[in-house]
Amino acid sequence: MSKGEELFTGVVPILVELDGDVNGHKFSVSGEGEGDATYGKLTLKFICTTGKLPVPWPTLVTTFSYGVQCFSRYPDHMKQHDFFKSAMPEGYVQERTIFFKDDGNYKTRAEVKFEGDTLVNRIELKGIDFKEDGNILGHKLEYNYNSHNVYIMADKQKNGIKVNFKIRHNIEDGSVQLADHYQQNTPIGDGPVLLPDNHYLSTQSALSKDPNEKRDHMVLLEFVTAAGITHGMDELYK
């Protein structure tokens, strides 16, 4: 068990803060909830603190919850590939460029680390080149979320990881908006981290609303499990 992994044996409170600017539309989001890495489970509620969110909530899911990949469930035989927990409590910097097909792009940078007993994901997001009446600024996405695989590989030069995946957002007219994600994680501290073999995270997310919440918001339930590395030969012959 890595030192950081010991911090995730129970339920951990999570705080998310996002400051964003998309095509000059400025906004802020606050989120809180909890994570349980034993089950790879996240429950979070996000509120736009500046009024109405200028972009559809689903476009921010990866920035919020795929940001705290330290809550992914890594099976016993894969624990030595869990970069995310090994970087704790000092945490990691997570940078992404997200290209929305035939539309604009988001650039994000986040620091994910423990502040006391709380896991904090503090994010900044800049969006440019979006069409005013496109799927994103025109709010044409359905309020739901598909399952995805998130592909992880070690980046030995930077003592971190590189992550690639493609998100499929459902559009109201029945078509799909693709969002290509290019991600890089580097540790904040200088302690040892686990550099993984290639593998993937399997994610399932459910979006809902709080019937008692008047502000623009999103409620998120998510399950994430690591996969893609088989048991070693010694395991097979037991």
Partner: nanobody
Framework: GGGSVQAGGSLRLSCAAS????????MAWFRQAPGKEREGVAT????????HYADSVKGRFTVSRDNAKNTLSLQMNSLIPEDTAMYYC?????????????????????WGQGTQVTVSS
């Protein structure tokens, strides 16, 4: 990293911070020309994604930061004589309201010692 340059040229200023975790601070560049008031040039959010520029430098200057190395930079291109001034880097803790508060020029309360930039025609 100040200095003298001909109009149309480029310069890069750097500022090294110490004694605080830069990733929790807004950073900014200011300048003061002889006989004029100090004016804001550019601000940058704690994680370096959200920038803001004075109209007079938009499209010519680019602010960036490297939190791992605790440095702030200002790349100045297409310089004009009106850019001649003493340039200062400045910092302030991330406001309670978040990174959007970094654009408040008057709130900056930690200052570097300044470097002279001279642009001749």
């Amino acid at each position: 990293g100040g200095g003298s340059v001909q109009a149309g040229g480029s310069l890069r200023l750097s500022c090294a911070a110490s004694g605080f975790a830069m990733s929790t601070y807004c950073m900014a560049w200011f300048r003061q020309a002889p006989g004029k008031e100090r004016e804001g040039v550019a601000t940058l959010s704690p994680l370096g994604i959200l920038s803001h520029y004075a109209d007079s430098v938009k499209g010519r200057f680019t602010v960036s930061r490297d939190n791992a190395k605790n440095t702030l930079s200002l790349q100045m291109n297409s310089l004009i004589p009106e850019d001649t001034a003493m340039y200062y880097c400045a910092a302030m803790p991330r406001p309670d309201g978040g990174a959007h508060g970094c654009v408040s020029w008057l709130a900056y309360n930690f200052w570097g010692q300044g470097t002279q930039v001279t642009v001749s025609s």
